[in-house]
């Protein structure tokens, strides 16, 4: 039994008074010629001539989907009864942006739900939103083709000082979150260990507060907080970080035992397990994947394995007893 099969049942369409069996008899050579499919569409049951009462199904090319009623009906006068049907793109095309902006990830097409991040060269920030998501066949929020990079006020203010500081005469002092952060700066997702909560904060405010010795604030990732693997890893990383022997400042972030600061992006990048050096007395007893055997790993290995989203259960700190 097929739902698409036509056994000649006398169906009545929603907006038709006449049953198919009531249609006038037609001569064999009459009927309808092949209809013209909508743009980016094609006819599934393609042939030269269709009988009166026969339906054709409109399908769309890969990357497009039908919107509207996708069946055409052959009428006695040789024309087609067709509702409004079109093939709408289900993917977004890589946006055209000014050359100074970098799109990550760089692809030709993006599926619905996929996001892109726009970034600028060092010392510059995107003059507007930096994260865009493919919804339907367009980007949300819409990407303006006049979108460009502007000088990062943070960089201007800091002079020769570190991030979160500003030049005051010949010395560096912490920026004031209230007074020095009224300008636009990119959004960061931040975790506060005191409140055990994460929130979106402008970069300037986060850096100023961190400079003022707010040690409870931890950088999670660039961009506003959004549920997903990046946030999940950011939180897990924060928990692991308390045992890290290495704490290396890197852009907005701090890199730990299992990470390396990328010189070109000023971001902490997870090492891969084989890149871990054996040294260090921060050991953990773990169970890998579905294995029942226990294994002693150092903090670097634990960090890289969790960063790679591989299944691992931490049984307890220290060496496995067996």
């Amino acid at each position: 039994f097929s739902i698409m099969e036509n056994n000649g049942q006398p169906c009545i369409n929603d907006d038709e008074e006449m049953k198919e069996v009531d249609l006038p008899e037609i001569e064999a050579d009459s009927g309808c010629p092949q209809p013209v499919p909508p743009e980016n569409g094609f006819i599934r049951n393609e042939k030269q001539l269709y009988l009166v009462g026969e339906d054709v199904e409109i399908s769309c090319l890969t990357g497009f989907e039908t919107v509207g009623y996708q069946y055409f009906r052959c009428l006695p006068d040789g024309t087609w009864r067709q509702g409004d049907v079109e093939c709408q793109r289900t993917e977004c095309i890589k946006p055209v942006v000014q050359e100074v902006l970098t799109i990550t990830p760089f692809q030709r097409l993006y599926r619905i739900g996929e996001s892109i991040e726009l970034t600028c060269p060092k010392g510059f920030v995107v003059a507007g939103p930096s994260r865009y998501t493919c919804q339907g066949n367009s980007w949300t929020p819409p990407i303006s083709n006049s979108l460009t990079c502007e000088k990062d006020t943070l960089t201007k203010l800091k002079g020769h000082c570190q991030l979160g500081q500003k030049q005051s005469g010949s010395e560096c002092i912490c920026m004031s979150p209230e007074e020095d952060c009224s300008h636009h700066s990119e959004d960061l997702c931040v975790f506060d260990t005191d409140s055990n909560d994460y929130f979106t904060s402008p970069a300037c405010k986060f850096l100023a507060e961190k400079c003022l010795n707010n040690q409870q604030l931890h950088f999670l990732h660039i961009g506003s907080c959004q549920d997903g693997r990046q946030l999940e890893w950011g939180l897990e990383r924060t928990r692991l970080s308390s045992n890290s022997t290495k704490k290396e400042s890197c852009g907005y972030d701090t890199c730990y035992d299992w990470e390396k600061c990328s010189a070109s992006t000023s971001k902490c990048v997870c090492l891969l397990p084989p890149q871990c050096f054996k040294g260090g007395n921060q050991l953990y007893c773990v169970k890998m994947g579905s294995s029942t055997s226990e294994k002693t790993l150092n903090i670097c290995e634990v960090g890289t394995i969790r960063c790679a989203n591989r299944k691992m259960e931490i049984l307890h700190p220290g060496k496995c007893l067996a």
């Epitope: 990830p105 090492l271 084989p274 989203n309």
Partner: antibody, heavy 118, light 112 residues
Framework: EVQLVESDGGLVQPGGSLKLSCVAS????????MAWVRQGPTKGLEWVAT????????YYRESVKGRFTISRDNAKRTLYLQMDSLRSEDTATYYC???????????WGHGTLVTVSS | DVVLTQTPSTLSATIGQSVSISCRSS???????????LYWYLQRPGQSPQLLIY???DLGSGVPNRFSGSGSGTDFTLKISGVEAEDLGIYYC?????????FGAGTNLELK
């Protein structure tokens, strides 16, 4: 200076066996994972196997699983690759490699040629 | 396995000329926490491969800064700004974002 020196390879018949070794110097051998990478005439560069610090964990590419065994002797600062049931497609120059925080294959030996042919 | 396609397969250049090599991946190398494990190696005639670029755009230790890497997702580029005689050889891209680690087939840079 990091140095990795592979033993001589050689000509082996299909189905035969060969054990490669790699002697390391210039760094604390037991503190690093180690790997074998090969370069065949047709397949180009291919990662073969990786071993952790003490040999308790080993990883292989699918095509060599069950035929090749990576092992190490930290006291001798030596990495091994036991190759059994050799096939013509295993013909390649085999390199011993050590990672760094920059890359998985940061340091390479000079390589040793293994030819599998009748 | 992830396939890395390098173009061109051979590149003829004159000393001082700037050249680019492309490496295209069969799937995105950007993982779900935002890291991309893409590397570039140079294998000079009769020598072992030598690391040039790691993590897409970071320069390997002791590598001259005429070498630069860029790209994201599936498209990556190695640029040499002013080729020197010692740069001749075969260039390989390699990915470690997905197991097993795979290499491109190589681009042979030769003198015109």
């Amino acid at each position: 200076e990091v140095q990795l020196v592979e033993s001589d390879g050689g000509l082996v018949q299909p189905g035969g066996s060969l054990k490669l070794s790699c002697v390391a110097s210039g760094f604390s051998f037991s503190d690093y994972y180690m790997a074998w990478v090969r370069q065949g005439p047709t397949k180009g560069l291919e990662w073969v196997a990786t071993i952790n610090y003490d040999g308790s964990s080993t990883y292989y590419r699918e095509s060599v699983k069950g035929r090749f065994t990576i092992s190490r002797d930290n006291a001798k600062r030596t990495l091994y690759l036991q190759m059994d049931s050799l096939r013509s497609e295993d013909t390649a120059t085999y390199y011993c490699s050590r990672p760094s925080t920059e890359a998985l294959f940061a340091y390479w030996g000079h390589g040793t040629l293994v030819t599998v042919s009748s | 396995d992830v396939v890395l396609t390098q173009t061109p397969s051979t590149l003829s250049a004159t000393i001082g000329q700037s050249v680019s090599i492309s490496c295209r991946s069969s799937q995105s190398l950007l993982n779900d926490v935002g890291n991309t494990y893409l590397y570039w190696y140079l294998q000079r005639p009769g020598q072992s491969p030598q690391l040039l670029i790691y993590l897409v755009s970071d320069l390997g230790s002791g590598v001259p800064n005429r070498f630069s890497g860029s790209g994201s997702g599936t498209d990556f580029t190695l640029k040499i700004s002013g080729v020197e005689a010692e740069d001749l050889g075969i260039y390989y891209c390699m990915q470690a974002s997905h197991a097993p680690y795979t290499f491109g087939a190589g681009t042979n840079l030769e003198l015109k």
